[in-house]
């Protein structure tokens, strides 16, 4: 069960795995989520009633029952890991903590103009996990404007203390904001001879590389394959670092592979999701459960659905045994990796897919936009789709947005008179309508899910989901856009764009090239003044220029109002309705997507 809210003045008793320091309960929850075993946590906030040495402690906990007894304790904040949740998770933390000194190894000290500059420096430094910046009000003159870059073994502070006139924060590498080089290559027959900070077992070099990526201290790795001569080192993944950040020595050795942390590629490469199956391979670890399963795929599903399961081994059924079901061994370990990997026993092994949600496809950086001009360029809005009807003839009907590999979010009013999903075709990766020919591949629509409270666009609930017949393979030209987070309701979006092939004036025709317009959001109070005959609800969001001139129009319906926030594009609105197009003091009205996130998740995960 997914529990996102924090429990104030509550402590979970027992189940301790380890204690780390975090500047907030919110970040403690993130640390717990990313820890291989943590399911619950208790954070101690600063409080006069608490011993200052316990302030900011984040105790990570585990429990076989997935819960622990609760005890009342002032200043304690407890909660659950997001492992139990199905929504996307990110380790990105842009918060700046005022008057907190986050302790670690201070390995670099330099002058910076601002905390932001210090944070950027940390983000672009290969070793940096977090920083502390002494502001210009700091009492000690020689320390003013000093930016201390820090790292620790765990990536979290070794202690956090109160210190006036300093601010602290984390590297934004996990926000995909680092300018560090992204080296994706894996080098065969190569050993990096640098100090090992840790070692784990891995079935292949790719998994080893992904483990290195989310290990806080790992900068590069060496993996010994199963053909490595020394038996005790087979499948060993050595996580490495060096002072320079690069391997000091490369040794040519057969059956070894080496590579780099993908920390700077995280926006474009999955680093948590190990989705492959390993045949004739057994993963050893602590046994969680043994369940009958029809196939290794079914076994992986069972592991994914069991929150404590980290990996599994499936042994296929012996002929006519147990109704053709094999045994599915659900397993875990202290670090999330098998304790040993054996070959030649006939098992099929793999990992939970639960961690895949930590790799958010929608955060992928896309092409830089062309500023000015109204025509888009290829790949500029890769989530935008054109929804065609084939009735009476094939034509663009509405826009839509890719939000998942089988899901398009669009407007309910697009489906007036559409009797069957079969007559619809979804085209993705399209810039010009003229590209769409008879033999252009498309996605058939399996189901149209219209919000059951929808009556007409002007009354709200103008939202619909299209379930596609086949899945979308993400590429640079077709990929999802992030849904806004419910926690971002108060975010003021300043970089919003409406896109579509719709009319450019009220009496016009569908445009050939995808058009774009940057449009400012308008408060609901302001919008209500412009539409006195309508009720502008909190489930709607408005955008437009007071003087008019830029707006969505007929044919843009269902398409996205995309807003860039923290370098990530969010689907803030769905083009819904308006009085005319681009009229003075008549903003466009959009479905406020954040208000429907629960509905979207309920429908898309109801499988």
């Amino acid at each position: 069960e997914c529990v996102t809210q924090l429990l104030k003045d509550t402590c979970f008793e027992g189940g301790d795995i380890t204690t780390v320091f975090t500047p907030s309960a919110k970040y403690c929850q993130v640390v717990c989520t990313y820890h291989p075993r943590c399911l619950l946590f208790t954070f101690t906030a600063e409080s006069p009633s608490e011993d200052p040495t316990r302030w900011f402690t984040c105790v990570l906990k585990d429990s076989v029952t997935e819960t622990l007894p609760r005890v009342n304790r002032t200043a304690a904040i407890s909660g659950y890991s997001f492992k139990q949740c199905s929504h996307q998770i990110s380790a990105c933390n842009k918060d700046i903590y005022v008057d907190l000194d986050m302790k670690g190894i201070n390995y670099n000290s330099s002058v910076a103009k601002s905390a932001q500059e210090c944070q950027e420096r940390c983000t672009d430094d290969v070793h940096c996990h977090f920083f502390t910046y002494a502001t210009r009000q700091f009492p000690s003159l020689e320390h003013r404007n000093i930016c201390l870059l820090k790292h620790t073994q765990t990536g979290t502070p070794t202690r956090i203390t109160k210190l006036d006139k300093v601010v602290s924060g984390f590297s934004l590498k996990s926000c995909a904001l680092s300018n560090l080089a992204c080296i994706r290559d894996i080098f065969p027959n190569t050993v990096f001879a640098d100090s090992n900070i840790d070692s784990v077992m891995a079935p292949d070099a790719f998994v080893c590389g992904r483990i290195c990526t989310h290990h806080p201290g790992c900068l590069f790795f060496t993996f010994f394959s199963q053909e490595w001569p020394k038996e005790s080192q087979r499948n060993l993944c050595l996580l490495k670092t060096s002072e320079s950040g690069l391997p000091s020595t490369r040794i040519k050795k057969s059956k070894a592979l080496s590579g780099f942390s993908l920390q700077s590629c995280r926006h474009s490469i999955p680093v948590f999701c190990h989705s492959s199956f390993y045949h004739d391979t057994d993963f050893l670890g602590e046994e969680l459960d043994i369940v009958a399963a029809k196939s290794h795929e079914a076994c992986q599903k069972l592991c994914t659905n069991a929150v404590r399961c980290q990996f599994f081994t499936y042994t296929p059924a012996q002929a006519s045994c147990n109704e053709g079901k094999g045994k599915c061994y659900l397993k875990l370990s202290s670090n999330g990796s098998p304790t040993k990997i054996l070959h030649g026993r006939g098992g099929i092994s793999g990992y939970t897919l639960r961690l895949c949600k930590m790799d958010n496809e929608c955060t992928t950086k896309i092409k830089p936009r062309i500023v000015g001009g109204t025509a888009s360029v290829r790949g500029e809005w890769p989530w935008q789709v054109t929804l065609h009807t084939t009735s009476p003839t094939q034509r663009h009907l509405c826009g839509g947005s890719i939000i998942g590999n089988q899901w398009i979010l669009t407007a309910a009013h697009c489906f007036y008179g559409v009797e069957s999903p079969k007559i619809l075709r979804v085209y993705s990766g399209i810039l010009n309508q003229s590209e769409i020919k008879e033999d252009t591949s498309f996605f058939g629509v399996q189901e149209i899910i219209i919000h059951d409270q929808y009556k007409m666009a002007e009354s709200g609930y103008d939202i619909a989901l299209l379930k596609l017949e086949t899945t979308v393979n993400y590429t640079d030209s077709q990929r999802p856009i992030c849904l806004p987070s419910k926690g971002d309701r108060n975010v003021i979006y300043t970089d919003c764009w409406v896109t579509g092939w719709g009319y450019r004036k009220l009496r016009d025709k569908i445009q050939n090239t995808l058009q774009k317009a940057k449009i400012p959001l308008v408060t609901n109070e302001e919008c209500q003044k412009r539409y006195r005959g309508h009720k502008i609800t909190h489930k709607m969001i408005c955008a437009g220029y007071r003087e008019g001139g830029k707006d969505a129009c007929k044919g843009d319906s269902g398409g996205p109002l995309s807003c860039k926030h923290n370098e990530v594009w969010h689907l803030v609105g769905i083009t819904s309705w308006g009085e005319g197009c681009a009229q003075r003091e008549r903003p466009g009205v959009y479905t406020n997507v954040v208000e429907y996130v629960d509905w979207i998740l309920e429908k898309t995960q109801a499988v």
Epitope: S391, P392, T393, Q394, E419, S420, I423, K437, R507, K509
Partner: antibody
Amino acid sequence: QVQLVQSGSELKKPGASVKLSCKASGYTFTRYWMHWVKQAHGQGLEWIGNIYPDSDSTNYDEKFRTRATLTADTSTSTAYMHLSSLTSEDSAVYYCTRMGFYAMDYWGQGTSVTVSS
Amino acid sequence: DIVMTQSPSSLSASVGDRVTITCKASENVVTYVSWFQQKPGQAPKLLIYGASNRYTGVPDRFSGSGSGTDFTLTISSLQAEDVADYHCGQSYSYPLTFGQGTKLEIK
């Protein structure tokens, strides 16, 4: 290549019914609308209706709604039009035509229906 | 229903002449207009779709133009084999409708 082959000529008495067939080949039958068009002798073209074989969705001209029934058999890639309560006004050539990506791009050879007592 | 008014209903022209047939829609049909050629005893054949796009294999002497409510089919240099009936049709909305046809003859 795409082909639409229609059934042969029909001679019917007033009040009777007729069922015309149109066998499609050379393309995915379920993915295209099939339309039926009437052409009385020396007259223009008149749209009757259409069917989407994959979902059996249909549309009819109001004039034919009560008497025409369009069906499709996806197993044989054949579209049918059943026309009931025939009168002399129904004497005409009836065409099936595929609505391609752009327009009615392929037409059957036509079936002549004569209604006479 | 959208009414498609085609004119003239018949016309006679000489080989090599430029021939124009017009079709007027009773309301905006954007560019969802097709032109068909029908020779005696044959089924119609698609010439022009989307008001101005020549269908595969159609000689380039045939061209279409127009949008909204007014549409034109032009034969730039009439050939003997162009003797036929010509029909315009709209596929913008149901019910689909056709013009009454134009009979084209050689003088």
